[in-house]
Interface confidence: low
């Protein structure tokens, strides 16, 4: 005679509030004679969930017809699931006895847990911009998920990051959990167009993880390089001086010219161009009148970038005597 096995195939059953949960239980033998009951929990305090013979269980229905003599499927459905329904459910075989039935064998149990999807991850970067080669922290938060097991990964432009710290709260049992992760990212000079991605995988998402992103353009400040040059060609009695401000980000930039320490209001022309890596170049032209200049003209191009301390480059103007002599003949 085959020994009776109580088969509860699912160790864990994730359910959603308001939905119906199906708890499976099959037996391998019709013997010994006696009923199968469902309980939540174990020990003397266990709660009776379903007894075909007696009691009123309005939310419970059976999957099969238990009145059929050869029935071996004792699965049940519980409708309108609430958080109060979580726990481990056992189908238990009783042997007919007198005056009362005797517990014979229990299934291994199915843990019913509320499955709640995590919220879309929100990624926050540092409060202030930082220059390349520095490490900045990004946080990723997702809330409201259950069960507690969750996987979080960080990526920078598709490359997985390893320097991060993750916590899931609370540590104990809860209806829903939150995850918070902090990743440390080293900024590269070309990161204006880079992204960091926080990816959250959870059993409720059925293999389709949620992603939150942050643009490194909001975290990075690429300081400019400056170059001041004098153009060999002159226009009439004027010399053209160029200040090239290269590879800076963000775009916020103030440029001023000064002549021998005196700030000049005039700027002939300027152009702003965007580089492939997202940084900017700014070129400013300044015309210096050399008709009756002394030989010691010093021009300064001063740049204040993104509210930082100003940087400047100086140029001592080279005006030859020959250039001065000829200046009266030039046509403007």
């Amino acid at each position: 005679e085959e020994e009776l096995q109580m088969i509860q195939p699912e160790k864990l059953l994730l359910v959603t509030v308001g939905k119906t949960a199906t708890l499976h239980c099959t037996v391998t033998s019709l013997l010994p004679v006696g009923p199968v009951l469902w309980f939540r929990g174990v020990g003397p305090g266990r709660e009776l969930i379903y007894n075909q013979k007696e009691g009123h269980f309005p939310r419970v229905t059976t999957v099969s017809d238990l009145t059929k003599r050869n029935n071996m499927d004792f699965s049940i459905r519980i409708s309108s699931i609430t958080p109060a329904d979580v726990g481990t459910y056992y189908c238990v075989k009783f042997r007919k006895g007198s005056p009362e039935n005797v517990e014979f064998k229990s299934g291994p149990g199915t843990e019913m847990a509320l499955g709640a999807k995590p919220s879309a991850p929100v990624v926050l970067g540092p409060a202030a911009r930082t220059t390349p080669e520095h490490t900045v922290s990004f946080t990723c938060e997702s809330h409201g998920f259950s069960p507690r097991d969750i996987t979080l990964k960080w990526f920078k432009n598709g490359n997985e990051l390893s320097d991060f710290q993750t916590n899931v709260d609370p540590t104990g049992q809860s209806v829903a959990y939150s995850i918070r992760s902090t990743a440390r990212v080293v900024l590269d000079p070309w990161d204006v167009r880079s992204q960091v991605i926080c990816e959250v995988a959870h059993v409720t998402l059925q293999g389709d993880p949620l992603r939150g992103t942050a643009n490194l353009s909001e975290a990075i400040r690429v300081p400019p390089t400056l170059e001041v040059t004098q153009q060999p060609m002159r226009v009439g009695n004027q010399v053209n001086v160029t200040c090239q401000v290269r590879k800076f980000y963000p775009q916020s930039l103030q440029l001023t010219w000064s002549e021998n320490g005196n700030v000049c209001q005039r700027e002939t022309a300027s152009t702003l161009t965007e580089n492939k890596d997202g940084t900017y170049n700014w070129t400013s032209w300044f015309l210096v009148n050399i008709s009756d200049q002394r030989d010691d003209v010093v021009l300064t191009c001063q740049v204040k970038h993104d509210g930082q301390l100003a940087v400047s480059k100086r140029l001592a103007l080279e005006v030859t005597v020959h250039q001065k002599d000829q200046s009266s003949d030039a046509t403007p």
Partner: antibody, heavy 119, light 107 residues
Amino acid sequence: EVQLQESGAELVRPGASVKLSCKALGYTFTDYEIHWVKETPVYGLEWIGDIHPGSGGTANNQKFKGKATLTADKSSNTAYMELSSLTSEDSAVYYCTRAVSGYYAMDYWGQGTSVTVSS
Amino acid sequence: DIQMTQSSSSFSGSLGDRLTINCKASEDIYDRVAWYQQKPGNAPRLLISGTASLETGVLSRFSGSGSGKDYTLSINGLQAEDVATYYCQQYWTTPWTFGGGTKLEIK
């Protein structure tokens, strides 16, 4: 006034078990975690684990897994730590402490219970 | 596990001195640092949490600072009642871990 009252000193034989108690007074027991800390001259202070009496949830230091079992009785506002299979390495002062749930420092400490394991 | 290293196990200072006790974590602990004072025969007492937040009733001559992996407890104007062992502890991730302690004595 917040107080954590720990049970008295214990002298136990190797291989035996001991159950230490920590009674919480002056605050809502189920709102805070109870943590347990071991103090020895060799290892200093070591965190054993914590229990949240409200949810029954625990967090453990793997080093003490199988050694320490944490429980809490809400009706008596008392937390317990049972230490099993005792050896001389378990001789120490054990403190129960309180912390706000969700990664906060231990703001109140019991007076400590001295456990001596000796034959 | 995160290791917390207190560079000096003992320290001798004079009354009125300003002294600092350093604590280094083996990885970034994001300001989740507490400092405890333990006097002989007593349980530890929380002085500072969250790197710099002084607990109620703790005198203002105690202060905390630091970030990332490096944290410091400062005592400004050493008093005789400050003789104790001081421990740092991280509560960034479990298992929570303590430094080895720094025993403070008066010269």
